[in-house]
């Protein structure tokens, strides 16, 4: 079963429809107004806690404060992903959770926050001044990262206050594109509202073809529209420390950065409401520099703690490439 957000999309006026432009002038400001109001700067918070029971055991909690839907979370230590950090865990809202030593237990706490327990023994165990970073790839905001560590004087059992995004970095493709559209939309909205004050609203004629058209409609993209505007959904583009960079670029690597998204993914209702439905097939992978891969395929999407998958219309194995960090 596919669950997709019902996002208003303007329907072009039907042929021969009287008063269509007037109606559209009324619909457009509301759509733009909604976008303007909901468009806020997303934020990532990180909380690091040393467990009182095991002095070298840490719990890292991270969350995403944004309206977009999360497509991938990467937790690293030793600095941000682009500055020598090492991947500890990768959490995909539908495909699963992959953790690497010394991570012990990574899990989704809610649809927009995760937690990770690090085990406290061995050469690779963390020390008190270790920096932990969380990166959230989301649609439409792009990729956002924040880091945090324990304050030097922390007592065991105490936690550092949540760090709200000291190292916020957004992928330009996601951020600038959407911000530009929203800025333009807001300016256009103001322009429309000013014009609207100075002239009477046009009289609407009932449609001869359909009593509801044109109207803001929920958009469930057809196969054709998916094929024409397919875009993968995980957009992480920074890497771990170069010496251990887990990178793979199947079939020439990511050539999709400029693509425009065509789907709006739904926001899950939290762990209690996460459904269990079939999984997409293997195939159609998109390479991301940590060796993380987003997958799509022909099977219906699985909504774990999760989001809508964007299937590749070319079918499974169209861009087969493996997962570097599972």
């Amino acid at each position: 079963m596919r669950t997709e957000a019902q996002v208003p999309a303007l329907q072009p006026p039907e042929p021969g429809l009287e008063g269509a432009m007037g109606h559209r002038t009324l619909v457009l400001p509301w759509v733009l107004l909604t976008l303007c109001v909901t468009a806020g700067t997303p934020e990532v918070w990180v909380q690091v806690r040393m467990e009182a029971t095991e002095l070298s055991s840490f719990t890292i909690r991270c969350g995403f404060l944004g309206s977009g839907s999360i497509s991938l979370v990467t937790v690293s230590w030793g600095g941000p992903n682009g500055a020598g950090g090492t991947t500890l865990a990768v959490l995909h809202p539908e495909r699963g959770i992959r953790q690497w030593a010394p991570a012990r237990q990574a899990r989704w706490e809610t649809q927009s926050s995760i937690s990770l327990i690090l085990e406290g023994s061995g050469a690779s165990s963390p020390c008190a001044n270790t920096t932990f970073c969380c990166k959230f790839a989301s649609f439409p905001e792009g990729s956002w990262e924040a880091c945090g560590s324990l304050p030097p004087s922390s007592d065991p059992g105490l936690s550092a206050p949540p760090t709200p995004a000291p190292i916020l970095r957004a992928d330009l493709a996601g951020i600038l594109g959407v911000s530009g559209v929203l800025l333009f939309g807001c300016v256009y909205l103001l322009h429309l509202l000013r014009r609207h004050k100075h002239r009477p609203a046009p009289r609407l004629q009932p449609s001869r073809t359909s009593p509801q058209a044109p109207r803001a409609r929920a958009w469930a993209p057809s196969q054709a529209s998916q094929a024409a505007l397919h875009v993968p959904y995980a957009t992480i583009n920074t890497s771990c420390r170069p010496a251990t960079l887990d990178t793979a670029h199947p079939h020439g690597g990511p050539s999709w950065w400029a693509s425009l998204p065509t789907h709006a993914a739904h926001r899950p209702q939290g762990p209690a409401a996460w459904a269990s439905t079939p999984i997409p097939a293997r195939g159609s992978f998109v390479s991301v520099e940590n060796g993380l891969y987003a997958q799509a395929g022909e099977r219906p999407p699985h909504t774990g703690p999760g989001l809508t998958l964007f299937p590749d219309p070319r079918g499974p194995r169209a861009m087969e490439g493996p997962l570097g960090v599972r």
Partner: antibody, heavy 118, light 107 residues
């Protein structure tokens, strides 16, 4: 055709060492996570270790942590498992396996038998 | 780690029977469950992933179902070649873990 061929198994005394190899062909080796899975004489399956595509990240089960080392040579399309301080409970058939991305183990080798006995 | 439990370790069945093998996870695995078939002397063979999706070449008499913690593998009409041991495996959260296996033998 994807092919995984293990070697290096044999009889070893407790406390001894052994190095298993797995030669991969039919796919781009350096773009896949690779794993070692073992099957005990009681027929239980256990993920022993796995390694990310570049070798930069590893996972070990608690039962082998500190004794086994997984590594890979991407130039030779080969996966390794260095086993030391072997115990009788390490006796098993060791399989080299390749998961497909987030999906489970689609490809398996034929296995190599490791027997730890005095 | 997530524990996987297959309640029956062995089944004695007749050819043509409908067989149901169950698997229970210690926590929700969001339908990220695989089923493998293993015949003596061979490596396991993946039959189903994602709880319901049949792998290429797997006969349609095999089917998978379930959600949350509880999953089922069904064989509608047992054939001679279906004899062997069946394992479930969660692929939601690493380390991926296997059930203890269910052996099917002919009566």
């Amino acid at each position: 055709e994807v092919k995984l061929v293990e070697s290096g198994g044999g009889l070893v005394q407790p406390g001894g060492s052994l190095k298993l190899s797995c030669v991969a062909s039919g796919f781009t080796f350096n773009t896949y996570i690779m794993s070692w899975v073992r099957q005990t004489p009681e027929k239980r399956l256990e993920l022993v270790a796995d390694i990310s595509n570049s070798g930069g990240n590893t996972y070990y089960s608690d039962t082998v942590k500190g004794r086994f080392t997984i590594s890979r040579d991407n130039a030779k399309n080969t996966l390794y498992l260095q086993m030391s301080s072997l115990k009788s409970e390490d006796t098993a058939m060791y399989y080299c396996a390749r998961p497909d991305n987030w999906d489970p183990f689609v490809y398996w080798g034929q296995g190599t038998l490791v027997t730890v006995s005095a | 780690d997530i524990q996987m439990t297959q309640s029956s370790s062995s089944f004695s069945v007749s050819l043509g029977d409908r067989v149901t093998i169950t698997c229970k996870a210690s926590e929700d695995i969001y339908a990220r469950l695989a089923w493998y078939q293993q015949k003596p002397g061979n490596a396991p063979r993946l039959l189903i992933s994602g709880a319901t999706s049949l792998e290429t070449g797997v006969p349609s008499r095999f089917s998978g179902s379930g959600s949350g913690k509880n999953y089922t593998l069904s064989i509608t009409s047992l054939q001679t070649e279906d004899v062997g041991t069946y394992y479930c495996q969660q692929h939601w959260s690493t380390p991926w873990t296997f059930g203890g296996g269910t052996n099917l033998e002919i009566k």
